[in-house]
Interface confidence: low
């Protein structure tokens, strides 16, 4: 594979050794310039699986809020705007990075983080298991 | 509210102004411990808005792979097993933070980016703009 | 503690305008969702507007649609109401609310009056 | 936009039950949240009952939400009525882009 040489004018390693500590600037840059804000405000309602926001908030992670998708119900909509219980709505699950502080309640301290989070709700057929 | 104090054996901030500049320990902790690893490993086949996962691989970003979801129809999967255009898959984003190697190349020096991703489809009624 | 408290509120006469303010502490502002409700005399509850936390979505009832416009400045922890061609039937008390989730008020402030006479 | 429809006024004696309805004109109330405001008089509102059956911390127990699929409706029901209960009642729901307040309750303490 091709090795990128490091660059020169990187700051110095405070700690040769894992774990391994970078320095990470926390002024974030925001990739999604050309994205609709709007682009998916309504899918938790019009969705077929619909679901909830609840709010998530802890004051040692970072971002400190964190948004969690929970299904209204076990079946999904059907076209008559019941609910079905032939079908199941199932949260899509994703594991995404967080700021943790480390030592806690540290401004400038952190270690990364992996949580699973429940983004949104997605109609699926049940895995039917047959009684023998 | 609560006033957490700030624990005296935090390390010094070296950079007191923005863009600040945090230490994090790159040894990650995972606290999904308790989760099913095939928590969803199936849903992008049985759902109704059934998905592909495409990788994205980027050196210079932590992590540096990342899975796209792209919905497979644009309609839905009815009962039948056809895809019902009365009804739309749409992907399901979320804004992720990732770590980008600033200054390029640099082993121990990031910046926080929001980037948009695609974690699955949900099925939803589409938008019906009548005409006047 | 959440705290919002509103101001500029007053006399105004019909055709003219009027900027609410909302100062909020307690709470990281930026995350939330924020709305304006008011109260005519005597009446109900009247939802008006809603902006996202980011302030990149903005809600309006049909009754205030092109002459109102609500948005934030997350650098000073305040909401807005810009209320322009206002109209008697504006006259209320008009409060400022942190959303729980969208649709939700979960805080309220005190309000403040504004009427709409010649 | 659809409409939310509640009683203007409820009368019970202190220590009974009292259930106030709220009956949502068009689309489905199952779909959407519905939460229960409280105002006393001179008093700014303050929620009750949120996520159709959710009390906030510091509301007592003895009030509890419900819906109604069938009869596309949301209650309030307040047990062990007390003195202080008496004001005026709220439901509230919305839909992705518009929010939407019933006309209010009276709720008399007798």
């Known amino acids: 594979g091709i090795t990128i040489p490091r660059n020169p004018g990187c700051p110095n390693s405070e700690d040769k050794n894992f774990p391994r500590t970078v320095m990470v600037n926390l002024n974030i840059h925001n990739r999604n310039t050309n994205t609709n804000p709007k682009r998916s405000s309504d899918y938790y309602n019009r969705s077929t699986s619909p679901w909830n926001l609840h709010r998530n908030e802890d004051p040692e992670r970072y971002p400190s809020v964190i948004w969690e998708a929970k299904c209204r119900h076990l079946g999904c909509i059907n076209a008559d705007g019941n609910v079905d219980y032939h079908m199941n709505s199932v949260p899509i699950q994703q594991e995404i990075l967080v700021l943790r502080r480390e030592p806690p309640h540290c401004p400038n301290s952190f270690r990364l983080e992996k949580i699973l989070v429940s983004v949104g709700c997605t109609c699926v057929t049940p895995i039917v298991h047959h009684v023998a | 509210g609560i006033t957490i104090p700030r624990n005296p054996g935090c390390p010094n901030s070296e950079d007191k102004n923005f863009p600040r500049t945090v230490m994090v320990n790159l040894n990650i902790h995972n606290r999904n411990t308790n989760t099913n690893p095939k928590r969803s490993s199936d849903y992008y086949n049985r759902s109704t808005s059934p998905w592909n996962l495409h990788r994205n691989e980027d050196p210079e970003r932590y992590p540096s792979v990342i899975w796209e979801a792209k919905c497979r129809h644009l309609g839905c999967i009815n009962a039948d097993g056809n895809v019902d255009y009365h009804m739309n898959s749409v992907p399901i984003q979320q804004e992720i933070l990732v770590l980008r190697r600033e200054p390029p190349h640099c082993p121990n020096s990031f910046r926080l980016e929001k980037i948009l991703v695609s974690v699955g489809c949900t099925c939803v009624t589409p938008i019906v703009h009548h005409v006047a | 503690e959440v705290q919002l408290l509103e101001s500029g509120g007053g006399l105004v006469q019909p055709g003219g305008s009027l900027r609410l303010s909302c100062a909020a502490s307690g709470f990281t502002f930026s995350s939330y969702a924020m709305s304006w409700v008011r109260q005519a005399p005597g009446k109900g509850l009247e939802w008006v507007s809603a902006i996202s936390g980011s302030g990149g979505s903005t809600y309006y009832a049909d009754s205030v649609k092109g002459r109102f416009t609500i948005s934030r400045d997350n650098s000073k922890n305040t909401l807005y109401l810009q209320m322009n061609s206002l109209r008697a039937e504006d006259t209320a008390v008009y409060y400022c609310a942190r959303d729980l989730i969208w649709g939700v008020a979960g805080s309220w402030g005190q309000g403040t009056m504004v009427t709409v006479s010649s | 936009n659809f409409m939310l429809t509640q009683p203007h006024s409820v009368s019970e004696s202190p220590g009974k039950t009292v259930t106030i309805s709220c009956t949502r004109s068009s689309g489905s109330l199952a779909n959407y949240y519905v939460q229960w405001y409280q105002q006393r008089p001179g008093s700014a509102p303050t929620i009750v009952i949120f996520?159709?059956?959710?009390?906030p911390s510091g509301v007592p127990d003895r009030f509890s939400g419900s819906i109604d699929s069938s009869s596309n409706s949301a209650s309030l029901t307040i047990s062990r009525l007390k003195t202080e209960d008496e004001a005026d009642y709220y439901c509230?729901?919305?839909?992705?882009?518009?929010?939407?307040f019933g006309g209010g309750t009276k709720l008399t303490v007798l």
């Open positions: 509230q729901s919305y839909d992705p882009r518009v929010v939407v």
């Open positions: 996520a159709n059956n959710q009390r």
